[in-house]
C-alpha cells in the first residue's frame, strides 16, 4: 500500500509521499534521491478517462483515480531508477547506477532439484513470518485514515506474504456505501477486465522482488505450476512442495507440510462490508484445500488440458468489447477463464486460470482469499507465462487494450490498485525477458490439427 515513511499525519495531510533517499542535511533534503539525480517529487499522474457505466458510484471509493484519494505527489524516477524513493532499480536492472541488466529464470516447480524445492518452500514460509520492510497497510478508508482523534494514522505492519494477500483483497473488495447500506459488489480492479493480466503480473513481480531482498538473493525467482495437465490430481500437492491432503480432514493440508501451519488473512468479509473497515493483519483459520473435491460441480474436478493453452494462444486480439467477463474472442478473457479455450464466451464455462482456482476447492477458489493458499503464486506465474508467450507472438500489440470505457480500474493508463509507487497497466504490457528482467523456462504445446476426412 504505502511506504512506512508516508503513513504519517504530515504526509497524509500534505498529500505528498516523497521519502528521502540519503538525507545528509536533515529530513526533506534528499526527496526521491534528488541530490544524486535519481528522481524528483512531482504531481501524480492518474487516469481520468471515463470507465464503463457498470460502476455508478463515482466519488464513493478510495480506489477511484488511484492514488489521489491519499496522495497527489510522489517520486518520479529518472532512467532506470525506481522505487518509492528512487532508491532501487527498474525490474531487470541493477547496480548503483541501475545500468547493468540481469535476467532471472522462472522454472517449473516440478523440475527443481530437491534442494531448490526445499529452498522455495522455506522462502515462502519466511515471507509469511517476515514483516514487510517497506509497506504498511491501511485498516480504514481515507475519511477515517487519521483515526477518531484525527491524529492517529490507521496503518499496520504486515508480513511480506500477507501484504501480497492484502493487496489482492483490496483490489477486489466491495465498495462501501455507508453503514446500513449494502456494499456494491459489481466492482473488481484486478479481474474481469483487461487489467487482469497486467495487475497480476505486477503483483507477482512485487512479491518476487520482496523475496529477493528478504533472502539477499538476486537470482531468486518464483517457479510456476503447469496446471494444464488434464488430470484430476494436484501434482504439486505433496509434502515436499505445497502440501498433501491431511488424513484427518480432507479439506486441510497435511501436518507434515509447513503450510498446514499457515493462517489466513482477510477472511472477515462481513465486518468489512457492513462496518466499512478494511482487512487488517490479523490471522484467522487454516488454509482449506480439497483438490478435485467439488462433487457438486464435476466440471471443476479436472484441470485444463494442455491443448487448452495451445488454443488460447491462437486468440490474436488481447481484449474485445465490452472488455468484461463476457467478452468473446478476447485472449485476456480466454486465459482468465470465462471463455472456452477457443475464445468463445459461454456463461457456463470455467476454463484455464479460473478452472485451476476452482479445482483447488477451498481458500484458493475464493477471490478475496485466494492468495492465502501459496499455490496461488504458482498458478499465476503459469498464467503470466502464457501472457508473456502471447506478448511475444503478437508483438505486444496493445491496440485492443482500451484507453477508456473499460470497467473501473481497467483502462490502459489506470494506476493499478493499490500498488505503490503508482504503476500503470501499460508498464506491464511488455515482453518480460526484454523489459522486466525475467524469463520462463517452458515448452509450449503445439496445436494438433485433425485432418478432415
Amino acid at each position: 500500500q504505502f511506504p512506512r515513511q508516508c503513513a504519517t499525519v504530515e504526509a497524509l495531510r500534505s498529500g505528498m509521499c516523497c521519502p528521502d533517499l540519503s538525507p545528509v542535511s536533515g529530513p526533506g533534503t534528499d526527496r526521491c534521491g534528488s541530490s544524486s539525480g535519481r528522481g524528483r517529487c512531482e504531481a501524480v499522474t492518474a487516469d481520468s478517462r471515463p470507465h464503463s457505466p457498470q460502476y455508478p458510484h463515482d466519488g464513493r471509493d478510495d480506489r477511484e483515480v488511484w492514488p489521489l484519494r491519499f496522495f497527489n505527489r510522489t517520486c518520479h524516477c529518472n532512467g532506470n531508477f525506481s522505487g518509492h524513493n528512487c532508491g532501487t532499480c527498474r525490474p531487470g536492472w541493477r547496480g548503483a547506477a541501475c545500468d547493468q541488466r540481469v535476467l532471472i529464470v522462472r522454472r517449473n516447480l516440478l523440475d527443481l532439484s530437491k534442494e531448490e524445492k526445499n529452498h522455495f518452500v522455506r522462502a515462502l514460509d519466511m515471507a509469511k513470518r517476515t514483516t514487510h520492510p517497506l509497506f504498511v497497510i491501511a485498516t480504514r478508508r481515507s475519511e477515517e485514515i487519521l483515526g477518531p482523534d484525527g491524529n492517529t494514522p490507521q496503518f499496520e505492519n504486515i508480513s511480506i506474504y500477507n501484504y501480497f494477500v492484502w493487496t489482492h483483497y483490496y483490489s477486489v473488495k466491495k465498495t462501501f456505501l455507508g453503514v446500513g447500506q449494502e456494499s456494491f459488489g459489481e466492482v473488481d480492479f484486478s479481474h474481469e477486465g483487461p487489467a487482469f493480466l497486467t495487475w497480476h503480473r505486477y503483483h507477482l513481480l512485487r512479491l518476487e522482488k520482496d523475496m529477493q531482498e528478504m533472502l539477499q538473493e538476486p537470482s531468486f525467482s518464483l517457479p510456476y505450476w503447469n496446471f494444464a495437465t488434464g488430470k484430476n490430481v494436484c501434482d504439486i500437492c505433496t509434502d515436499d512442495l505445497m502440501g498433501s491432503r491431511s488424513n484427518f480432514d480432507s479439506t486441510l493440508i497435511s501436518p507434515n507440510s509447513v503450510f498446514s501451519q499457515w493462517r489466513v488473512v482477510c477472511d472477515s468479509l462481513e465486518d468489512y462490508d457492513t462496518l466499512g473497515t478494511l482487512c487488517n493483519s490479523t490471522e484467522d483459520g487454516p488454509i482449506r484445500r480439497n483438490p478435485a473435491g467439488n462433487v457438486a460441480r464435476p466440471m471443476v474436478q479436472r484441470l485444463p488440458e494442455p491443448q487448452d493453452v495451445a488454443q488460447c494462444l491462437e486468440v490474436g486480439l488481447f481484449d474485445t468489447p465490452p472488455f468484461y467477463s463476457n467478452s468473446t474472442n478476447s485472449f485476456r478473457n480466454t486465459v482468465e477463464g470465462y471463455s472456452d479455450p477457443t475464445g468463445k464466451y459461454d456463461p457456463a464455462v470455467r476454463s484455464l486460470h479460473n478452472l485451476a482456482h476452482l479445482f483447488l476447492n477451498g481458500t484458493g477458489g475464493q477471490t478475496h482469499l485466494s492468495p492465502n493458499d501459496p499455490i496461488f503464486v504458482l498458478l499465476h506465474t503459469f498464467t503470466d507465462a502464457v501472457f508473456d508467450e502471447w506478448l511475444r507472438r503478437y508483438n505486444a500489440d496493445i491496440s485492443t487494450f482500451p484507453l477508456e470505457n473499460a470497467p473501473i480500474g481497467h483502462n490502459r493508463q489506470y494506476n493499478m490498485v493499490p500498488f505503490w509507487p503508482p504503476v500503470t497497466n501499460t508498464e506491464m504490457f511488455v515482453t518480460a525477458p526484454d523489459n522486466l528482467g525475467y524469463t520462463y523456462e517452458i515448452q509450449w504445446p503445439s496445436r494438433e490439427f485433425s485432418v478432415p476426412e
Epitope: 547496480g95 547493468q100 529452498h119 539477499q216 538473493e217 538476486p218
Partner: antibody, heavy 121, light 107 residues
Framework: QVQLVQSGAEVKKPGASVKVSCKAS????????LHWVRQAPGQGLEWMGW????????VYAQKFQGRVTMTADTSTSTVYMELSSLRSEDTAVYYC??????????????WGQGTLVTVSS | DIQMTQSPSSLSASVGDRVTITCRAS??????LAWYQQKPGKVPKLLIY???TLADGVPSRFSGSGSGTDFTLTISSLQPEDVATYYC?????????FGQGTKLEIK
C-alpha cells in the same frame, strides 16, 4: 569506526557444541545482514550462512543445515553462531562479517578478527 | 549451487610485474562478485566489489573486470606487500560460495 569483535578461542570435544559471539560497534546491526565464514587450517574460505538481526531470519548453507544456529541480540549489538555435533573437520577459524545491501552491493566489507575453534578428543 | 574456480592456484611474480588472477563461475552471476585479499595470519580484506568497483582505501594498482562467468583481478605493478592469498566470492544465488584461492608469492 566499524568494528566486529569476536569471542576468544575455544577447544571442544567431538559431539559437543560451540557458541561464538560477535559484537558490533560503529553501525546499527539492524541495518545489515551478518554473515559467518570459516577457514580450516591451511584451507580456503567457506561461507556458512547469514542472519538478519532486525528480524532474526537466517539462511544456512546446505552443508551446515541442522547443525548451525545463528542468533542476534540487538540490545547488545551482538550476533552468535552455534555449531553442534562437532567433529574434527570443524576445526577452523570462524569469522563474522557484514554485508552492506545498499544497491545489492556484492561484498562482505568488514570482518571480525576470527575465532579459532579446535575440535579434539 | 554455483561453483567458483580460480586459476592459477598459486603463482610467483616479480616486483613491478603485472599480475592477473582469474575466477570462473559455473553459471552466469552477472557482476555479483567480490575479491578479497588475505595476508598470512590475517583477516580477509575486501578489495573489489560488484566485479569492478574498488573498495575504500584499496590502492589503485588493483582492478577488477569481467561479467557473467569470467572475471579477472589485476595488479598492475606488483608490490612486496601484495603477497597474500586472493579469493573471489559470488553473491548471485545461495549459497554464496568462494573460489578456492590463489596464493601469490614474490620471486
Amino acid at each position: 569506526q566499524v568494528q566486529l569483535v569476536q569471542s576468544g578461542a575455544e577447544v571442544k570435544k567431538p559431539g559437543a557444541s560451540v557458541k561464538v559471539s560477535c559484537k558490533a560497534s560503529g553501525f546499527n546491526i539492524k541495518d545489515y545482514f551478518l554473515h559467518w565464514v570459516r577457514q580450516a587450517p591451511g584451507q580456503g574460505l567457506e561461507w556458512m550462512g547469514w542472519i538478519n538481526p532486525d528480524n532474526g531470519n537466517t539462511v544456512y548453507a546446505q552443508k551446515f543445515q541442522g547443525r548451525v544456529t545463528m542468533t542476534a541480540d540487538t540490545s547488545t549489538s551482538t550476533v552468535y553462531m552455534e555449531l553442534s555435533s562437532l567433529r574434527s573437520e570443524d576445526t577452523a577459524v570462524y569469522y563474522c562479517t557484514r554485508r552492506d545491501y545498499t544497491y545489492e552491493k556484492a561484498a562482505l566489507d568488514y570482518w571480525g578478527q576470527g575465532t579459532l575453534v579446535t575440535v579434539s578428543s | 549451487d554455483i561453483q567458483m574456480t580460480q586459476s592459477p592456484s598459486s603463482l610467483s611474480a616479480s616486483v613491478g610485474d603485472r599480475v592477473t588472477i582469474t575466477c570462473r563461475a559455473s553459471g552466469n552471476i552477472y557482476n555479483y562478485l567480490a575479491w578479497y585479499q588475505q595476508k598470512p595470519g590475517k583477516v580477509p580484506k575486501l578489495l573489489i566489489y560488484d566485479a569492478k568497483t574498488l573498495a575504500d582505501g584499496v590502492p589503485s594498482r588493483f582492478s577488477g573486470s569481467g561479467s557473467g562467468t569470467d572475471f579477472t583481478l589485476t595488479i598492475s605493478s606488483l608490490q612486496p606487500e601484495d603477497v597474500a592469498t586472493y579469493y573471489c566470492q559470488h553473491f548471485w544465488s545461495l549459497p554464496f560460495t568462494f573460489g578456492q584461492g590463489t596464493k601469490l608469492e614474490i620471486k
